[in-house]
Amino acid sequence: VPEKSVRWCAVSEHEATKCQSFRDHMKSVLPSNGPSVACVKKASHLDCIRAIAANEADAVTLDAGLVYDAYLAPNNLKPVVAEFYGSKEDPQTFYYAVAVVKKDSDFQMNQLRGRKSCHTGLGRSAGWNIPIGLLYCDLPEPRKPLEKAVANFFSGSCVPCADGTDFPQLCQLCPGCGCSTLNQYFSYSGAFKCLKDGAGDVAFVKHSTIFENLANKADRDQYELLCLDNTRKSVDEYKDCHLARVPSHTVVARSVGGKEDLIWELLNQAQEHFGKDKSKEFQLFSSPHGKDLLFKDSAHGFLKVPPRMDAKMYLGYEYITAIRNLREGTCPEAPTDECKPVKWCALSHHERLKCDEWSVNSAGKIECESAETTEDCIAKIMNGEADAMSLDGGFVYIAGMCGLVPVLAENYNTPNPNCENTAEEGYFAVAVVKSSSDLTWDNLKGKKSCHTAVGRTAGWNIPMGLLYSKINHCRFDEFFSEGCAPGSEKNSSLCKLCMGPSPNLCEPNNKEGYYGYTGAFRCLVEKGDVAFVKHQTVPQNTGGKNPDAWAKNLKEEDYELLCLDGSRKSVQEPANCHLARAPNHAVVARKDKADCVQTLLLDQQRMFGSSVTDCSSNFCLFESKTKDLLFRDDTVCLAKLHDRNTYEKYLGEEYVKAVTNLRKCSTSPLLEACTF
């Protein structure tokens, strides 16, 4: 197979014919050293998936349900290119499956039993697979046949295409369950009409259905969406209140050696030459031979799927949960409203050891999952492999953009017993230098810098945000002569100062000796000119408070703070000499797990929190000898957020604005994936 050939998989004669035409037309417009198309014909999409996994083909376009099959072992395929719909300016690559109800009704998602339901059709994504998959564990047993369980769950339904003889209740609202537009309640508009007419109490449709059927906002305002957290929202708020986000049509490839760059190069060129309204001779998004061949006729173009986005992230936790429930038919033994153990995400093996000790002491109420970077942990929480972790504000922002929510805040200053209910203002992000140096905020260019990690608040977002507004470019590695900013590109000058050891050099976890607040300060002590840390870092690591060899003889008066006005002050005066106020670290979780996590953590801190005085013979949640493992060591308690329960509210407008501005300099692959 030529190096630059993409073997496209076709599933019918008509698709094969279009594929050959695609191949010939691409050959005519691309240079001889550019990508080329070869066509492989298989009997079905599943056969195509297997062929790609076996390296007999390279690419095929699939619906969401098949993307799930493609991701399962042993196939292990991943999404590489997405079709988009709508305009180039506002491309839609996903739709949202929603549960619509009338505003004057008063039930929530967990009160659907005994209601009347309207569905688009049996086996369809938004109308059946997703809602029934998510409700699966609430259905009465036996859950097979599924139609019977659903019939016994709702008090009456319209499920077009269902068997009305065997399951008459499923056709109660539309006699015969007609499987075409002859049934007035068929498909999206029909299911919505079923609700509108008062036949049903809830309609399972797409987010756009309401807008397509009700042009008038006043009419739309008579309806609401049911959210999975048992609240309701307006129909405009579908991004924050849906059953699942469903990818429309996606090109998949192998996860390893999958030619994704080549596939993108090919499709990008293809849309330039043969996309919507581009060419008379060949059209990528239509065909005289049939409908939706190779690509959907309704597609307007392609978007490259960010490399960090695997199939789990692409399909989303809710969609995968729904499909897995339907396919595997398994439900937890415990009732779904009971808190299962909370899986904490630990960074590298040091945090894992502390987490394991916590797990043992919690009698298994806490379980542990590990990842090598904070972003990998956030991804694991998103896809359900983990449930929670405590994050610096910079990562609370990324987690929030990825759909996670803050649950509890770390408090550092409020003594018990008021701590749990107190909202602290935050801590100070400061720039620390040696007293013996002549550095000021205005002459840092060309100096050696020490950072907690890329993407963290005090160590990166605040100082680099301020720097960006001064230098107006993102080449921070050129501004400083060298430095240690864990998480930077390994060949960057901002990894030059890091200590490692070797395979972990510049890694954003505790295996890198200069990682985190204490690590950045150590970097200043041993090699650097300036360290960007929290205001408590110097006091916490001097005067013998840190027993490690490098720190035990350090004196607080040997260090000073840089003020933004060009002056310097004692480390005792952070309130008058800081870069900005930083939001406290916070615990994040998926929305569906937030209440569980909060309840369990409040209980855990009563047993293992700062009320424990002897940490040498008892487990202490907020202690790890200055290493800030799992939580900051100076945490007094985890505090309730009250109404600050979204990442925007928690971080505050000013900080969100600062981080959003820095996004043009972002090196976060996860953030890129979550904002796709």
């Epitope: 040091h350 050891l353 043992v360 002491n361 009698a363 040498s616 013979s617 008892n618 487990f619 290493k627």
Partner: nanobody, 117 residues
């Protein structure tokens, strides 16, 4: 310097039993949570069972009902009684005392357990 010495490993047939011991000696008395870990080739070290200072225990799902952890504080020793052994229990077993810190590598040599017919 603290030393943790594991013993009691060996080869056994599926369904058989073994009792592992771990003695802590040196400058720090064992006063905190202790645990048994295991590591098989190419896999991460995983927590098998733990026991708090007060004697509360916790087990990995894969060994629940088959393994029992216990301790003798006077002897600074922790035990792992392993019954109904399976081939997938084959690994090197290590013990740790969490009071030694999460950073210093205080792992002992470990003791090999092999389960095969």
């Amino acid at each position: 310097q603290v030393q943790l010495v594991e013993s009691g490993g060996g080869s056994v047939q599926p369904g058989g039993s073994l009792r592992l011991s771990c003695a802590a000696s040196g400058s720090i008395a064992s006063i905190n949570t202790m645990a048994w870990y295991r590591q098989s080739p190419g896999k991460q070290r995983e927590l098998v069972a733990g026991i708090t200072r007060g004697g509360s225990t916790n087990y990995a799902d894969s060994v629940k009902g088959r393994f029992t952890i216990s301790r003798d504080n006077a002897k600074n020793t922790v035990y792992l009684q392993m019954n109904s052994l399976k081939p997938e229990d084959t690994a090197v077993y290590y013990c740790t005392d969490y009071s030694l810190g999460y950073y210093q590598d205080y792992w002992g040599q470990g003791t090999q357990v092999t389960v095969s017919s």
